[in-house]
């Protein structure tokens, strides 16, 4: 029975050239988190494994930094970074929990954070 919920940073915006932290938090479950995947569409950005720690995909090494915590920091943002990002929590025994974040990278200097929201 999957009882957990994922809270994410929701819809967020950031300035071109800047950086942003993507954060997810799994709650309401006693399931063991074995790995967290960070993905953009179907591209794997990074993995945080309970045994191995962090692995950043080679193609993103220059612009992605692990943390804080199980979050992910995107640096040197471009307009092409606009889009959906997913945190996928692999847990036992529950299985897979997915959180969604939409990032908009703005040309202007007006970049405000959206509200937090939950995905069951």
């Amino acid at each position: 029975m999957m009882t957990g919920t994922i809270e994410t940073t929701g819809n967020i915006s950031a300035e071109k050239g800047g950086s942003i932290i993507l954060q997810c938090h799994l709650s309401s479950t006693t399931a063991q988190v074995t790995q967290v995947n960070w993905e953009q569409q179907d591209q794997l950005l990074a993995i945080c494994n309970a045994d191995l720690g962090w692995h950043i995909s080679p193609s993103f090494k220059d612009r992605v930094a692990p943390g804080p915590g199980l979050g992910l920091t995107l640096q040197s943002l471009t307009v092409n970074d606009t889009g959906e990002y997913f945190c996928i929590y692999h847990t036992y025994p529950d299985g897979t929990y997915t959180g969604r974040i939409f990032l908009e990278v703005l040309e202007s200097s007006v970049a405000e954070h959206g509200a937090r929201f939950q995905i069951p």
Epitope: Q32, N49, A50, D51, L52, Y92, D94, G95, T96
Partner: antibody, heavy 119, light 107 residues
């Protein structure tokens, strides 16, 4: 080339024990979670157990919990499945398989080792 | 446990044809379904994962689709080496479970 070679299967009486091994080569064994999957004589596939890359976490299907123990020796590039209190329904071909780094399915399998539980 | 119903269990086709194999889950498994090929004397091969992502090295004539409870494996322009046993497997929650298999034979 990734290779997984199982061994240790055989004929055993009900209530008996057996230890299967799976020797890995061609990849950094310590970086991957590993699984045991079995195939019944009727060709049904069943996931049996899984172990994390460092061996810290182990998971089992309900029917083998308390009877089977999955373990690994990363220095020897070897995965193990220790089976006790064997039952006739444990008769199957046992495969070791490597879990994808992103955890989405099993990308390499061994050729299997046969276990027969019969009196 | 998530039950996976795979159909058909047997399929006969000719080289060059296009075939589909279906898997239905007893509850939603999001996109997390994998497809495997089993051939005598060879090790099982991962074809598709996460419903539609082609495993590295697998020919593009193999494709997967679906999400939620209903999934399909399509093999277009069948090659002689494609005649084999095919299994689907959900990798959404433990215990991971498999479909009963589809035997694809030459007509």
């Amino acid at each position: 080339e990734v290779q997984l070679v199982e061994s240790g299967g055989g004929l055993v009486k009900p209530g008996g024990s057996l230890k299967l091994s799976c020797t890995a080569s061609g990849f950094t064994f310590s970086s991957y979670a590993m699984s045991w999957v079995r195939q019944s004589p009727e060709k049904r596939l069943e996931w049996v157990a899984e172990i994390s890359s460092g061996g810290s976490y182990t998971y089992y299907t309900d029917t083998v919990t308390g009877r089977f123990t999955i373990s690994r020796d990363n220095a020897k590039n070897t995965l193990y499945l220790e089976m006790s209190s064997l039952r006739s329904e444990d008769t199957a071909m046992y495969y070791c398989a490597r879990k994808r780094r992103d955890y989405y399915g099993m990308d390499y399998w061994g050729q299997g080792t046969s276990v027969t539980v019969s009196s | 446990d998530v039950q996976i119903t795979q159909s058909p269990s047997y399929l006969a086709a000719s080289p060059g044809e296009t075939i589909t194999i279906n898997c239905r889950a007893s509850k939603s498994i999001s996109k997390y379904l994998a497809w495997y090929q089993e051939k005598p004397g060879k090790t099982n091969k991962l074809l598709i994962y996460s419903g539609s992502t082609l495993q590295t090295g697998i020919p593009s004539r193999f494709s997967g689709s679906g999400s939620g409870t209903d999934f399909t494996l399509t093999i277009s322009s069948l090659e002689p080496e494609d005649f084999a046993m095919y299994y689907c497997q959900q990798h959404n929650e433990y215990p991971w479970t498999f479909g009963g298999g589809t035997k694809l034979e030459i007509k």
